[in-house]
């Protein structure tokens, strides 16, 4: 039975086996085509989601589709039902929390009262000015809180108490990539993790431990990537894994927050990386223990210099490392989070690519998560 499962796939009607390597190869080998059903699927970027959250106290903004202008949501007459609608528009299914925060004198966007129409937030027609003088601060999910704060050092062993959103993504019980829990159903990782194996069956997620072998595996229902863009082959290195059963959150299993749409991190901003990846370039072995390291944002211009990546780093990527080199993500860390701490921890990057590991002029290159928020929200909405 184990051997059969490992090397063969059972087609139905009529029942017969096909070699597992014929799964997800683009050819219908089973009469009903089920060999091409449970495969990595691509999902387009989709339309603009008409709500977003700002790094200014997680305040809600709403798009006026007629003009293309964004507006801040006034707290006047804002209700729990409107909060739920806003979060559903971003694909969240959990119960949101919201509060009033004072408008500041440097408020740039205009402020409008919000209403609902066909399960979408809209600006209320001919509403008055914002009498409360307050904006809506909205949290769709409790996220980004860990039991333990890491110390700022170079590289050290990590505890799952510090990084309860970190998961190991495994194929045939072998660790392939890292990933981050975003909500009970969804894990964020890199698309390139699935290049070799595009069948969903053998992929598993392990959560809740900092040791590689020691935690139960979770079945995966779907793996979703963005359509490949041949113009920018290294772009779109992002994937969402939908778990078959929702996670139960605990001290060691918790979600990390997505970044705000306007989360612009300046060079030298401190960030953290974690993973079970190789501890040496081109050799060594996977680390059995989760490792953590503090790095910093490296300016894209510097990263694209002639002695570095020579223009390969696009606007949808970011670089991080330490200027003198020596601290970096490596093979096996792919898909894991690049993290920023404000009030909560945010996954601002996904470990993607780089030349070597830890070189001074070639730091790690990360998928910029804020560039894909729209895609993430559209995937979640489609799967609600």
């Amino acid at each position: 039975k184990v051997i059969l499962d490992k090397y063969y796939f059972l087609c139905g009607q009529p029942l017969h086996f096909i070699p597992r390597k014929q799964l997800c190869d683009g050819e219908l080998d089973c009469p009903l085509g089920e060999d091409e059903e449970h495969c990595v699927k691509s999902f387009p970027e989709g339309p603009a989601v008409a709500v977003r959250l700002s790094k200014d106290r997680s305040t809600l903004q709403v798009l006026d589709s007629a003009t293309g202008n964004w507006f801040s949501a006034c707290f006047d007459n804002f209700t729990e039902a409107l909060a739920e609608t806003a979060c559903r528009q971003m694909g969240y299914s959990s119960k949101p929390t919201f509060r009033a925060v004072e408008i500041g004198p440097d408020q740039d966007l205009d402020v409008v009262e919000i209403t609902e129409n066909s399960q979408e937030l809209r600006m209320r027609n001919s509403s008055g000015p914002c009498l409360s003088g307050s904006l809506v601060s909205l949290h769709c999910l409790a996220c980004g809180k860990s039991l333990k704060t890491p110390r700022v050092v170079g590289v050290e062993e990590a505890s799952v108490d510090s990084w309860p959103w970190q998961v190991s993504i495994q194929y045939d019980k072998q660790h392939v990539c890292g990933g981050s829990i975003l909500d009970p159903h969804w894990v964020l990782t890199a698309a390139h993790c699935f290049r070799k194996h595009t069948d969903v069956f053998n992929w598993k997620v392990r959560a809740g431990s900092d040791k590689l072998g020691s935690f139960p595996s979770l079945a995966v229902a779907k793996i979703i990537i963005i359509e490949f863009n041949p113009m920018y082959p290294k772009d779109n290195d992002i994937a969402l894994m939908k778990l078959q059963f929702p996670l139960t959150f605990s001290g060691t299993v918790r979600p990390i927050c997505l970044p705000f749409f306007d989360e612009e991190l300046t060079p030298a901003t401190p960030l953290w990386i974690i993973g079970w990846g190789f501890t040496k370039q081109n050799g060594g072995k996977m680390s059995d223990i989760l490792l953590q390291a503090s790095v910093q944002v490296i300016d894209s211009t510097r990263c694209n210099a002639d002695d570095a990546y020579q223009g390969e780093v696009t606007e949808k990527m970011m670089c991080a490392g330490i200027p003198e080199g020596g601290v970096d993500t490596c093979q096996g860390d792919s898909g894991g989070p690049l993290m920023y701490q404000s009030d909560q921890w945010h996954v601002v990057g996904i470990v993607s690519w780089g030349y070597g590991c830890g070189g001074p002029s070639t730091p790690g290159v990360y998928t910029k998560v804020s560039a894909y928020l729209n895609w993430i929200y559209n995937v979640w909405k489609a799967e609600l």
Partner: antibody, heavy 121, light 107 residues
Framework: QVQLVQSGAEVKKPGASVKVSCKAS????????MHWVRQAPGQGLEWMGW????????HYAQKFQGRVTMTRDTSTSTVYMELSSLRSEDTAVYYC??????????????WGQGTLVTVSS | DIQMTQSPSSLSASVGDRVTITCRAS??????LAWYQQKPGKAPKLLIY???RLQSGVPSRFSGSGSGTDFTLTISSLQPEDFATYYC?????????FGGGTKVEIK
């Protein structure tokens, strides 16, 4: 684009009243507070009060309490400022000014062209 | 009421000069401060709000700074079209109050 067009110049006798209008266009009239500010010849700017065009609610500077009345007509998107018991020191250019965003504490951004009111016997 | 005191009341400068105008509030106003430019016979024009935010369409040679009670408007390189009167204004509390104005004249 946002426009505030005020009524023409007025000459009034002391003790009389004047009513200045300010017609708004290019935006949702009810969504923004409107201030009235005046400027005597060769002098600085003096705030008179505000009106909420949605509710008609007003707030006046202490100096003008009892003499000033601000009203609005939502059907024509027009606000009015009436000043009574005029005296010579009320000779000034009167401006209506809309706030930058729909919030009371944002500064006036859009201004009318001004209405000169001359009080002379 | 919050008093706004501007200085100097007038100044003479040449094209290309760096010009600084100060405004002092009689009590703390956080950063609820705006600056206006007014030319003769025209309505005031908003240059800066929230102490340092440049209003859209205003040249970057204008900048604002300060907080609490002391504020500054700086014109980094005076241009011919900048000769005008400048007012500060607080919107921290009603009544809104303006400074007395600073007239920038050609030397």
């Amino acid at each position: 684009q946002v426009q505030l067009v005020q009524s023409g110049a007025e000459v009034k006798k002391p003790g009389a009243s004047v009513k200045v209008s300010c017609k708004a266009s290019g935006y949702t009239f009810t969504g923004y507070y409107m201030h009235w500010v005046r400027q005597a010849p060769g002098q600085g700017l003096e705030w008179m009060g505000w009106i909420n065009p949605n509710s008609g609610g007003t707030h006046y500077a202490q100096k003008f309490q009892g003499r000033v009345t601000m009203t609005r007509d939502t059907s024509t998107s027009t606000v009015y400022m009436e000043l009574s018991s005029l005296r010579s020191e009320d000779t000034a250019v009167y401006y209506c000014a809309r706030v930058r965003i729909g919030w009371l504490q944002s500064p006036p951004l859009y201004w009318g062209q001004g209405t000169l009111v001359t009080v002379s016997s | 009421d919050i008093q706004m005191t501007q200085s100097p009341s007038s100044l003479s400068a040449s094209v290309g000069d760096r010009v600084t105008i100060t405004c002092r509030a009689s009590q703390g106003i956080s950063n609820y401060l705006a600056w206006y430019q007014q030319k003769p016979g025209k309505a005031p024009k908003l240059l800066i709000y929230a102490t340092s935010r440049l209003q859209s369409g205003v040249p970057s040679r204008f900048s604002g700074s300060g907080s609490g009670t002391d504020f500054t408007l700086t014109i980094s390189s005076l241009q011919p079209e900048d000769f005008a009167t400048y007012y500060c204004q607080q919107s921290y509390k009603t009544p809104l109050t303006f400074g007395g104005g600073t007239k920038v004249e050609i030397k």
